[in-house]
């Protein structure tokens, strides 16, 4: 039996400078395109090689973007979120949520609070 899988959630402010080809990442999500069940948030789906985000190194695929330049991304249509990034200017401040998967307890050991059994 595997140990329980937990997630460590952290938040970070990331300041990116728009490069020659832009910010260099893709997003999924929005009220019309839920990527995570019961969550219409905006998630990073791809970081492009040699783009601004990749060169900065902090933004990761799977991160949830909470705000852009202080503007909340809650309850936005997908295209409205895309437009927000495209119109965000040269210096772009992102508030992001990283979700790090953590194995809780060794294999063969049922961790405390495991719902099974």
């Amino acid at each position: 039996m595997n140990g329980r899988v937990d997630y460590l959630v952290t938040e970070e402010e990331i300041n990116l400078t728009r490069g020659p080809s832009g910010l260099g990442f893709n997003i999924v999500g929005g009220t019309d395109q839920q990527y995570v069940s019961n969550d219409s948030g905006i998630y990073v789906s791809r970081i492009k090689e040699n783009g601004a985000a990749a060169l900065d190194g902090r933004l990761q695929e799977g991160d949830k973007i909470l705000s852009v330049n202080g503007q909340d991304l809650k309850n936005l249509l997908h295209q409205d979120a895309v437009d927000l990034f495209r119109n965000a200017g040269y210096a772009v401040s992102l508030r992001v949520q990283h979700r790090l998967q953590v194995q809780n307890g060794p294999i063969g050991h049922r961790g405390e609070g495991d719902p099974s059994g």
Partner: nanobody
């Protein structure tokens, strides 16, 4: 492994029609942008049409009203129906896929794509 396979090209008379298909494997089309691009001999690859990750279609001006892009997520296939074909439509047609929407450019920009097919030849003559 992600793979895109185009089919359906061939030799067509001017004014004729053809439908090219792009079948994807290794991923499901939901959340993906899919683009059709073409490259004529001696020319750069150019965007023709694309459908973004929420299903909106885009066309380059030269094909508006003649070409129609559609997707069938259940069959993991994207189609490009090409009508009223002209000799200048002769090219190798490629499909490309990318996960999500680029925050930098529309899906007609070939630099946004991570995955490409091998192409199918369409000759209008």
């Amino acid at each position: 492994q992600v793979q895109l396979v185009e089919s359906g090209g061939g030799l067509v008379q001017p004014g004729g029609s053809v439908r090219v298909s792009c079948v994807s494997s290794g991923f499901i089309l939901d959340y993906y942008a899919i683009g059709w691009f073409r490259q004529a001999p001696g020319k750069e690859r150019e965007g023709v049409s694309c459908i973004d990750s929420v299903g909106r279609a885009y066309y380059v001006d030269s094909v508006k009203g003649r070409f129609t892009i559609s997707r069938d997520n259940a069959k993991n296939t994207v189609y490009l129906q090409m009508n009223s074909l002209k000799p200048e439509d002769t090219a190798v047609y490629y499909c490309a896929a990318d996960f999500g929407s680029s925050v930098d450019s529309t899906c007609l920009n070939n630099q946004q794509y991570g995955y490409w097919g091998q192409g199918t030849q369409v000759t209008v003559s």
